[in-house]
Each structure stands twice: as structure tokens, then as C-alpha cells.
């Protein structure tokens, strides 16, 4: 009997309101044993996949998707989905990314705190595990 897959959660660092030209990282979380995380934009037709997974906590794994320099066209709704063999999960709730004109430049601390959507709260990082800073812009052929 196949297990019921929990819905993933999605959050954004440093927040969901990002000054033009600043960076944002979407963090998708799911259970242990996820093979692929997918970040979807607005609809299923625009997405980015990664198989580079972190052990986020004893019961969770995660993946990170980073936009290095946010443009107005990046504003919109994002959600996560994952593949844990042999099936895909349901989608997370949508997270809305807002892009605003920046008066203080890319390092201006005027973003909202990290926001998450989904059924689970993000637990603290487990000290055993590697959590490297992310730096990838989302794939042009998919999410721009």
C-alpha cells in the first residue's frame, strides 16, 4: 500500500516583498526520501526542478531555488511539488512574490520577514547537516 504523501511547504528568504535587483530564495520542504523538488510558477507549465536535496531535519528534506537579481517579471505566484518514488505529491499552497522599486539598493533591509505557506511550520535547521548558501538564478528556459 502506497503511503499518503504530505503536502510540501514553501517559504521565501528573506521574505515575499523583494526590492528590484535583490535576491530571493524559495525553500521547498517535504518528507524524507524526496528525489526531486519542483518549483512551479503561476501554473504547472512553468517550473524548475532540482535533485540537490538537503537533510533539513530528522523528518524532512528540502531544496532551494534562488533568483539572484529579481526583476518585475519575477513577481507572481509560486508553489512547490515533489517526487517521492513512485509518485508526485500534491502542490503546496501558493506563495506570492511581490517586487517593489528599491530606494535603498540591493542591501536595503526593507523586506518583509520570511513567509511560508503549507501545512507544516519550518523547524530549526539540524546542526548535523550542511546548509550552504544558495546562489542559483532560476533557469531562464523555465521561470523567466
Amino acid at each position: 500500500q502506497e503511503e499518503d504523501l504530505p503536502r510540501p511547504s514553501i517559504s521565501a528568504e528573506p521574505g515575499t516583498v523583494i526590492p528590484l535587483g535583490s535576491h530571493v530564495t524559495f525553500v521547498c520542504r517535504g518528507p524524507v526520501g524526496v528525489q526531486t523538488f519542483r518549483l512551479e510558477r503561476d501554473s504547472r507549465s512553468t517550473y524548475n526542478d532540482t535533485e540537490d536535496v538537503s537533510q533539513a531535519s530528522p523528518s524532512e528534506s528540502e531544496a532551494r531555488f534562488r533568483i539572484d537579481s529579481v526583476r518585475e517579471g519575477n513577481a507572481g505566484l509560486y508553489r512547490c511539488i515533489y517526487y517521492k518514488p513512485p509518485k508526485w505529491s500534491e502542490q503546496s499552497d501558493y506563495l506570492e512574490l511581490l517586487v517593489k522599486e528599491s530606494s535603498g539598493g540591493p542591501d536595503s533591509p526593507d523586506t518583509e520577514p520570511g513567509s511560508s505557506a503549507g501545512p507544516t511550520q519550518r523547524p530549526s535547521d539540524n546542526s548535523h547537516n550542511e546548509h550552504a548558501p544558495a546562489s542559483q538564478g532560476l533557469k531562464a528556459e523555465h521561470l523567466y
Epitope: V32, G33, V34, Q35, D49, T50, E51, D52, V53, S54, Q55, P58, S59, S61, A63, R64, F65, R66, H128, N129, E130, A132, P133, A134, S135, Q136
Partner: antibody
Framework: EVQLVESGGGLVQPKGSLKLSCAAS????????MHWVRQAPGKGLEWVAR??????????YYADSVKDRFTISRDDSQSMLYLQMNNLTTEDTAMYYC???????????WGQGTSVTVSS | DIQMAQSSSSFSVSLGDRVTITCKAS??????LAWYQQKPGNAPRLLIS???SLETGVPSRFSGSGSGKDYTLSITSLQTEDVATYYC?????????FGGGTRLEIK
């Protein structure tokens, strides 16, 4: 079918250097973390190094036995993985495998390996 | 570093036997445990990940179980092609570590 083909092994003197290469094909290389794992003759498996993807800043991790001597790197545009090995000792004699990461640390596809012998 | 101890370095077995190989971690690895099969002259092959999940193409006579520090690989009815060395590996934390291996030999 996923393919990982290692090259660059050979005979090298102690304190010498060698650079191993791994050509990856038939999968989206830039979305996977990658590893090097080695196996000394007649011995078990030893994890050597791991490199993550650009989305995780190409973060690298090493076994204590190779830290500060070996460097793992990648070229996503060419789907290539590398291992630069410096200050080699006889303890580094082994078959070196290029391996694809799965599930955040498990290893699902392995190359056939390239042999490194360190001897004077 | 997390140490991985396998039950025995070698087993003498008969075809058709049920075989159980155990692996014990020095601390809880939260089911981040993989099993590999290696035949002489070949690269290892991933059999099981996340302690219990059988990889595609692996025969159903193989199964994995366990949690916490203690894990088991079982082969229900040993076939000729199963004669190999089996390794466990933890991927809860770096440095990733393998067990010493368990070699199956035919009696």
C-alpha cells in the same frame, strides 16, 4: 541511460599530483550534486568528496583524510566533474569512482572507476 | 563522525537461504541509510535508500528495514546472482560513511 566515465588515473609518485575527470551524459547534470568515492585494493568503500549544485553555491564537503589536499569541482556547461589530488601518499592508492547523488547523499549511479596508484 | 558497523565481514550461505545483514550506526541516522551491492570487478549498485525504499529494477526478494541506529538488509531466497559484497552507508551527515562490507559466499 545515465553514463559516468572517469579518466585521468595512473601511476604517480608520492607527493605528486593528479587530476581526475568524469564525463557525465544522459541526465541533467546541473541539477544533481555529485561525489567521488574510492576503494583501495581489496578494501571497502570510502567517501571522498561531494559538490552541490549552483543553487547551493557549489558547496563542497570532504573526508578528513583528503581535506586540504583534494579539491572537487565541476563544469556544468560541459557536464564534467573533477578531482584535483595533491600531495598524494601511498594511502591514496585506490579505484576512484564518480557517483551521482540521490535523495541528499545516497548514490544512485556509479562510473566504472579510474585506478590511481601512488608508488615510488 | 558517524561510524557504521556491519554484522560480519563474510557469510557462508546456501542458495535459497534467507540472508540477513545488519548495520549499526554509532548514532541515530534518521533512516538516511542506503544499501549497495558490489560484484567483483564492478562498481557498486544502489539497492535501497531511506532504509526501506527499493530502487527501480531491484528484485523484490531484497528488502530493508530499521530505524534509529539499527538497520537490516534481507534477501528472502538467495540466488546465484546475489553472491556479492554488500555495503551500508549513512547520509544523515557529512562525512558520509560506509560500513566495512559483508561478503556472501556459497557453501
Amino acid at each position: 541511460e545515465v553514463q559516468l566515465v572517469e579518466s585521468g588515473g595512473g601511476l604517480v609518485q608520492p607527493k605528486g599530483s593528479l587530476k581526475l575527470s568524469c564525463a557525465a551524459s544522459d541526465f541533467t547534470f546541473n541539477t544533481y550534486a555529485m561525489h567521488w568515492v574510492r576503494q583501495a585494493p581489496g578494501k571497502g568503500l570510502e567517501w571522498v568528496a561531494r559538490i552541490r549544485t549552483k543553487s547551493n553555491n557549489y558547496a563542497t564537503y570532504y573526508a578528513d583524510s583528503v581535506k586540504d589536499r583534494f579539491t572537487i569541482s565541476r563544469d556544468d556547461s560541459q557536464s564534467m566533474l573533477y578531482l584535483q589530488m595533491n600531495n598524494l601518499t601511498t594511502e591514496d592508492t585506490a579505484m576512484y569512482y564518480c557517483v551521482r547523488d540521490r535523495y541528499g547523499g545516497a548514490m544512485d549511479y556509479w562510473g566504472q572507476g579510474t585506478s590511481v596508484t601512488v608508488s615510488s | 563522525d558517524i561510524q557504521m558497523a556491519q554484522s560480519s565481514s563474510s557469510f557462508s550461505v546456501s542458495l535459497g537461504d534467507r540472508v540477513t545483514i545488519t548495520c549499526k550506526a554509532s548514532e541515530d541516522i534518521y533512516i538516511r541509510l542506503a544499501w549497495y551491492q558490489q560484484k567483483p570487478g564492478n562498481a557498486p549498485r544502489l539497492l535501497i535508500s531511506t532504509a526501506t525504499s527499493l530502487e527501480t529494477g531491484v528484485p523484490s526478494r531484497f528488502s530493508g528495514s530499521g530505524s534509529g541506529k539499527d538497520y537490516t538488509l534481507s534477501i528472502t531466497s538467495l540466488q546465484t546472482e546475489d553472491v556479492a559484497t554488500y555495503y551500508c552507508q549513512q547520509y544523515w551527515s557529512t562525512p558520509y560513511t560506509f560500513g566495512g562490507g559483508t561478503r556472501l559466499e556459497i557453501k
